[in-house]
């Protein structure tokens, strides 16, 4: 008899009562941006504290009634949803809500601002556990908001954002475009993307995972201990501020790129319809509905890791488009995507001092979007290995030749517009797993890692006739870190990581003709940490 | 209302000699950039976040404002500082009129400008 | 059928602790649908609200009586109690417990007090 | 707090008369507010809910209106068995009793 919900997020094999602690998020505070709340709703009753910060723009229009169960709707229930004592995701979480919302639910951007750095002051002044920032809010895109957010986020702090509930690509919308903010998208109790009237939940690339967000039951403002159903991108916002805050209750030191990495990694995978999506978006937008981990106990020992996808490129000749890892990240591989599939491949360069994912656009390409594979790797020393083109007929191969290094992605960059349409395809020698293969005329970059106890291995899955979509997965206990096509597959459109699968795109099989062009094959290389599991084994 | 131009006229007075010097001169090279919200209905014109370089101190913040008020002021315009901000950005969030815009983006320590928009609950 | 059963001292000395305790019948506490709840009745005299607590052990009380009371659940034994500190003869009452829709599950029916125990009497008296 | 206060404090009727009772919040309820019967010797019942609801098991003959600050419980025609005491309750804030109206026979 719990909420649907609640349910959802829990793992299946607990129930999800007994599940959830009557603690659970204790030593972490949660600050709230939104509207004025009902603090003595029993639900959030002592466990919400109203701070004296309020930032709003006066209500539209000369006839406004201000009435304070109205005024406190959104907020209250958000809190609720956060923390509250029976709908709660976080049960034992403390919260702090800042007004920076007005009765109609509208704020400024610059109110927004005043409000997060009140947050950041109120730090310095007195340090606390772990800090969740939750803004169940969105606007246009702001330059400003995403360097706020950004400061705050390097400050410590999880800031979690709702995508925007408008139907359209979250990176169009403010905070939600801040690739240091953790943005939400909302799924109802059929794992569909949300539908609110004409327009429904944001997606795309900015969108980190989806959470419940319809018919979300939650303290309502109308009495001190009534319930009501609100439904948005909100709603789904506050439950992964809940679920963040349970796991940093478990692991106060998680940092913010390690709390994102387990969230993908402990969410449900591709049962979201992407049909809903525009079909552009799709590729871009991730399957993932948010749960709880299946254990408050830390995930240390495994090898986390996440698919970045760049801003499309833009269609001119010699447009680039660059996904970038968060600063605690390594990048382990680099590929590229082109739905026109004229592209010049990708490659691995340093950008002040880490590196980056360049994806380069070809003559006639509509542009293209490059996909980084960003993952925690403590201790790692990794480098990029670079081949140019070869004049032999064998093609270009570049290998980790570094001591303790091993492989762990291929990138493959050309300059001639069109590769392999009038050249034979290349045969990858076997038995040589740690070197990368390419076309003669292209330049081969190999990503070389040492850290304790990786290691990494190679594998294929080729199909002989021409198919839309090639995969290969990781077996269980082994991460995906790089995702390529073998070369000689010149109507490949790219490749990318999807979860623990390798997925190799080619154009429509209708307009390939069945030569032996058509033969297409993924290359995964899959690693694991050995180092890391000891590590967890010897804490417990 | 009233007090705010005294203030201004004291303002003129004690940023003169400071605003006619060239000891903080924008740096060659860097032309500060003027941001807003694409979505119009969301727009509100006549607010401005001033956002100043990264290594910016309050001190600077502050003296950038009032900088802009005394050159608004020379020029007729009223303005009104509402927040300084320090602790995540360096800057400054001013009430003025859209003309002085091209006056601000060349104050030094500025990076960018960004008119203020609406956000809404979600 | 769910029945609720009042248990406890029927005196107490002033300045003491009144003890009560409320056993669940027909039904499980164990549930996020419910909260569990004490109203008291001073002899002629009308209701009040004393406060309650969920099987998870969250509590919410009267703001003026917050200061003495202490409500208890025990899921195990499908009890949930009430201690009041230092009673005095106002606080002399038929003490009743009483089941709560919490609203969470609106299927569970109205958010009101319903069932109640049939009550006891505990006088305060030296 | 919100505070209840019931009128008449005491209504003597014969039975198969009509009763109407009254209660008045002393800022807004909504439509949060209940009607409970007690009888000598026995814990309170719930009559009405949520201002108009009937509670299961309830006569027809009991209804309750009002939202807001004023409400009525109504006993379109009393039987021997209404006679007892009437307290309304709400809970848009807490929860608060009124101070009760005693029905009795006339």
């Known amino acids: 008899s719990i909420p649907w919900n609640l349910e959802r997020i829990t793992p299946p094999r607990y129930r999800a009562d007994e599940y959830q602690p009557p603690d659970g998020g204790s030593l972490v505070e949660v600050y709230l941006l939104d509207t004025s709340i009902q603090s003595d709703h029993r639900e959030i009753e002592g466990r919400v504290m109203v701070t004296d910060f309020e930032n709003v723009p006066e209500e539209d229009g000369t006839r406004f009634h201000r009435q304070a169960s109205k005024c406190d709707s959104h907020g209250t229930h958000l809190a609720g949803v956060v923390s509250g004592r029976d709908a709660g995701v976080a049960k034992g979480a403390s919260m702090r809500s800042l007004r920076v919302l007005n009765c109609q639910g509208k704020g400024t951007v610059s109110g927004t601002l005043i409000g997060l750095e009140f947050i950041r002051k109120s730090q310095l002044v007195q340090p606390v556990g772990p800090l969740v920032v939750l803004l169940p809010l969105a606007g246009g895109y702001s330059r400003v908001l995403n360097a706020a957010c950004q400061r705050l986020a390097r400050a410590g702090v999880v800031l979690v954002t709702a995508a925007g509930n408008f139907r359209d690509d979250a990176c169009l919308y403010s905070p939600a475009s801040a690739p240091e903010v953790i943005t939400v998208g909302a799924t109802n109790a059929q794992d569909q993307p949300v539908t609110l009237g004409t327009l429904g939940t944001n997606f795309g690339r900015c969108v980190d995972l989806f959470a419940p967000g319809e018919d979300i039951i939650g303290a309502s403002s109308d009495c001190s201990t009534c319930f009501v159903s609100q439904s948005g991108t909100s709603q789904a916002a506050a439950h992964v501020a809940g679920i963040a805050a349970m796991m940093l209750s478990a692991e106060p030191e998680l940092t913010l790129a390690e709390l994102r990495q387990r969230l993908i990694h402990f969410s449900a995978k591709d049962v979201i319809n992407e049909a809903w999506f525009p079909e552009d978006q799709r590729v871009l937008t991730p399957n993932l509905v948010a749960a709880l981990p299946p254990s408050t106990h830390g995930a240390g020992w495994q090898l986390f890791c996440r698919t970045v996808w760049s801003a499309h490129s833009g269609p001119t000749r010699m447009a680039t488009a660059v996904a970038r890892c968060a600063p605690d990240e390594e990048l382990l591989s680099c590929s590229s995507f082109s739905r026109s599939g004229k592209r010049r491949g990708e490659r691995m360069e340093a950008q002040g001092g880490k590196l980056v994912c360049r994806a380069h656009n070809a003559f006639g390409g509509e542009g293209v979007y490059a996909i980084a594979r960003c993952c925690l790797l403590p201790q790692a020393n990794c480098s990029v290995h670079t081949a140019p083109p070869a004049e032999a007929s064998m093609g270009t191969r570049v290998h980790c030749h570094q001591q303790g290094h091993v492989l762990t992605g291929c990138s493959s960059h050309w300059e001639v517009e069109d590769l392999g349409t009038h050249k034979p395809p290349v045969l990858r020698p076997r038995g040589q797993p740690n070197q990368c293969v390419g076309h003669r005329e292209a330049s081969i970059h190999a990503s070389c890692c040492h850290a304790p106890g990786l290691e990494c291995k190679v594998k294929e899955h080729g199909i002989p006739a021409p198919q839309e979509q090639v995969t290969v997965a990781c077996e269980e206990g082994w991460t995906l870190t790089g995702c390529s096509a073998l070369p000689g597959t010149s109507h490949v459109l790219g490749a990318y990581a999807v979860d623990n699968t390798c997925v190799v795109r080619s154009r429509d099989v209708s307009t390939t003709g069945s030569t032996s062009e058509g033969a297409v094959t993924a290359v995964a290389i899959c690693c694991r940490s050995r180092h890391l599991a000891q590590a967890s084994q010897e804490l417990q | 209302q009233e007090d705010e131009d005294g203030d201004y006229e004291e303002l003129v007075l004690a940023l003169r000699s400071e605003e006619d010097g060239l000891a903080e001169a924008p740096e060659h090279g860097t032309t500060a950039t003027f941001h807003r919200c694409a979505k119009d209905p969301w727009r509100l014109p006549g607010t401005y976040v001033v956002v100043l370089k990264e290594e910016t101190h309050l001190s600077q913040s502050e003296r950038t404002a009032r900088r802009l008020q005394a050159q608004a002021a020379r020029r007729g315009y009223l303005t009104k500082i509402l927040h300084v901000f320090h602790g995540l950005l360096p800057g400054f969030l001013v009430k003025m009129s859209g003309d002085l815009l091209e006056l601000a983006l060349k104050l030094p320590h500025v990076d960018y400008i960004e008119e203020d928009s609406s956000v809404f609950a979600q | 059928q769910l029945q609720l059963q009042e248990s406890g001292p029927g005196l107490v000395k002033p300045s003491e602790t009144l003890s009560l305790t409320c056993t669940v019948s027909?039904?499980?506490?164990?549930?996020?649908?419910?909260?569990w709840t004490w109203i008291r009745q001073p002899p002629g005299k009308g209701l009040e609200w004393i406060g309650s607590?969920?099987?998870?052990?969250?509590?919410y009380y009267n703001p003026s009586l917050k200061s003495r009371v202490t409500i208890s659940v025990d899921t195990s034994k499908n009890q949930f109690s009430l201690k009041l500190s230092s009673v005095t003869a106002a606080d002399t009452a038929v003490y009743y417990c009483?089941?709560?829709?919490?609203?969470?599950?609106?299927?569970?029916?109205?958010?009101?007090?319903?069932?109640w125990g049939q009550g006891t009497l505990v006088t305060v008296s030296s | 707090e919100i505070v209840l206060t019931q009128s008449p404090a005491t209504l003597s009727l014969s039975p198969g008369e009509r009763a109407t009772l009254s209660c008045r919040a002393s800022?807004?309820?909504?439509?949060?507010l209940a009607w409970y019967q007690q009888k000598p010797g026995q814990a309170p019942r719930l009559l009405i809910y949520?201002?108009?609801n009937r509670a299961t098991g309830i006569p027809a003959r009991f209804s309750g209106s009002g939202s807001g600050t004023d409400f009525t419980l109504t006993i379109s025609s009393l039987e021997p068995e209404d006679f007892a005491v009437y307290y309304c309750?709400?809970?848009?804030?807490?929860?608060?009793f009124g101070g009760g109206t005693k029905v009795e026979i006339k």
């Open positions: 009483a089941r709560e829709n919490s609203g969470v599950v609106p299927a569970a029916g109205p958010n009101w007090f319903d069932p």
């Open positions: 027909g039904g499980s506490i164990w549930s996020s649908s419910y909260y």
């Open positions: 607590i969920n099987y998870r052990g969250s509590t």
């Open positions: 800022q807004s309820v909504s439509s949060y």
């Open positions: 949520d201002a108009s």
């Open positions: 309750q709400q809970r848009r804030n807490w929860f608060t």
